[in-house]
């Protein structure tokens, strides 16, 4: 007779989750000779430590402790790009302006980037049937809070001019309820943080309007401003343009509004 | 061509201790998981312990958690294994093996295996 | 008593095709690889499978690997004198943190 086992709303955990996990971070290490000394078992063991045999509405940043420490990274703190809802453009951009760093590009990123995992209450497996769901189930899944713990800790870390991409294309450019705006924004350190420039970028080919008058950045500006932080904006009319410059910029066309 | 040289095995009384060596060579040790993995007379295989590349991280068979200590020293592509409170059904020849992908060990298959080294137990 | 169940030996005549089974629970086989090993009279264990049916350099094509369920089998084609040995099925227990092994299986060639 089959166990009762509860049923989230939510995909199950990725098929082949811990040899995924392992693999990355195998090829990880091996791509950046700055974190070769990292255990990549013992990274595995502390991931999995942080949510098996416990229930998936109940994880707290505190699991994810043990792997924070072993992830522990240095990125220079001036070359942070942090992005909402726009993920794939922004990690080409780093793909070739290869000095700049978003949250998936560090070793912890890039381990969970677009993997689902959850366990269950008292039993050591692997739930690869369902997962909560952050709005229909609970926000304090495994994959949410653990987002959040390393969001909140790369915001933290950042210095200077950090760099922020947003999507103009949806009704909320910037949206309090994402993860920028809800954990990053309010994470940004005023004493180290000199300025958050965001690029919206645009979508239609014939948009030429200044998204960046656009009531949800005016939000965000304020929301910066009142943590003594500067607020620039520009607006990235052309995105295949603009990837184009980023890896040719001697390019003549490059020289014109992008 | 990958190698692995196992020695230290012996006859050892009952509630004593051995420590048995892997020699390896052929391939980057530091780069690879190993285990150590045993076989009593006439019987099957046993997996006994694992070790990460990196030694940072290891487990043990139920049967031997509290006095067998997989370790490595990787300056000299040695894999060990320290042996304590030995019972008779220790008895067996104890093959060292190589983890086939790099650093971690779960679901990583020993794909080069060391002619073993025999443990005999009796008083 | 393992937790992967072999029948204790199987046989079959040259260039015949002979499968071994391997019997697990929902807690191994069913979420996790399955590997197999070969072992020769006198000899020490040689990887055969990987990850339920790959095979590694060198092990010859007439070996396969299969998975449906809590069950894994080996199947060996065209059948030649020296495949006698003893055949092991093994899983990695990410709950036990464990190799589980098989107890074995003889192939006599007749």
């Known amino acids: 007779v089959p166990r009762w086992r509860q049923q989230w709303s939510g995909p199950g955990t990725t098929k082949r989750f811990p040899e995924t996990v392992l693999a990355r971070c195998v090829k990880y290490t091996e791509i950046h000779p700055e974190m070769r000394h990292v255990d990549c078992q013992s990274v595995w063991d502390a991931f999995k430590g942080a949510f098996i045999s416990k229930h998936p509405c109940n994880i707290t940043e505190e699991d994810y402790q043990p792997l924070m420490k072993l992830g522990t990274q240095t990125v220079p703190c001036n070359k942070i790009l942090l992005w909402s809802r726009i993920k794939d453009l922004a990690h080409q951009f780093t793909q070739v302006q290869r000095d700049m760093f978003t949250l998936e590009d560090t070793l912890l990123g890039y381990l969970a980037d677009d993997l689902t995992w959850c366990g269950e209450f008292n039993t050591s497996k692997i739930n690869y049937q369902s997962c909560p769901d952050w709005r229909k189930d609970c926000s304090n899944n495994p994959v949410s809070v653990f987002w959040k713990t390393v969001s909140r800790r790369f915001a933290e870390a950042a210095c200077d001019v950090v760099h922020v991409m947003l999507n103009g294309s949806r009704s909320k450019i910037f949206d309090k309820n994402s993860t920028f705006g809800s954990v990053e924004v309010h994470n940004l350190q005023p004493e180290k943080v000199q300025t958050l420039e965001a690029w919206v970028i645009h979508g239609g080919r014939e948009d030429s309007r200044d998204l960046c008058q656009d009531p949800t950045i005016k939000e965000l500006e304020s929301i910066i401003s009142k943590r003594n932080i500067q607020f620039s904006c520009k607006n990235i009319y052309r995105p295949d343009k603009f990837l184009q410059c980023v890896k040719n910029p001697e390019d003549s066309s490059c020289t014109s509004e992008i | 061509e990958v190698q692995l040289l196992e020695s230290g095995g012996g006859l050892v009384q009952p509630g004593g201790s051995l420590r048995l060596s892997c020699a390896a060579s052929?391939?980057?040790?530091?780069?690879?998981?190993m285990s150590w993995v045993r076989q009593a007379p006439g019987k099957g295989l046993e997996w006994v312990s694992v070790?990460?590349?990196?030694?940072?991280?290891?487990s043990n068979a139920d049967s031997v958690k509290g006095r067998f200590t997989i370790s490595r020293d990787n300056s000299k592509n040695t894999l060990y294994l320290q042996m304590n409170s030995l019972r008779a059904e220790d008895t067996a020849v104890y093959y060292c093996?190589?983890?086939?992908?790099?650093?971690?060990?779960?679901?990583?298959?020993?794909?080069?295996w060391g002619q073993g080294t025999t443990v005999t137990v009796s008083s | 008593q393992s937790v992967l169940t072999q029948p204790p030996s199987a046989s079959g005549t040259p260039g015949q095709r002979v499968t071994i089974s391997c019997s697990g629970s929902?807690?191994?086989?069913?979420?996790?690889?399955v590997y197999w090993y070969q072992q020769l009279p006198g000899t020490a264990p040689r990887l055969l499978i990987y990850?339920?049916?790959q095979r590694p350099s060198g092990v010859p094509d007439r070996f396969s690997g299969s998975k449906s369920g809590t069950s894994a089998s080996l199947a060996i084609s065209g059948l030649q004198s020296e495949d006698e040995a003893d055949y092991y099925c093994?899983?990695?227990?990410?709950?036990?943190?464990?190799?589980?092994f098989g107890g074995g299986t003889k192939l006599t060639v007749l």
């Open positions: 052929g391939f980057t040790f530091e780069d690879y998981a």
């Open positions: 093996a190589k983890g086939m992908e790099r650093q971690y060990y779960s679901y990583n298959a020993m794909d080069v």
């Open positions: 093994a899983t990695w227990d990410d709950n036990l943190n464990s190799w589980l």
């Open positions: 990850k339920d049916d």
């Open positions: 929902n807690s191994n086989i069913d979420v996790d690889y």
């Open positions: 070790i990460s590349s990196k030694g940072g991280s290891t």
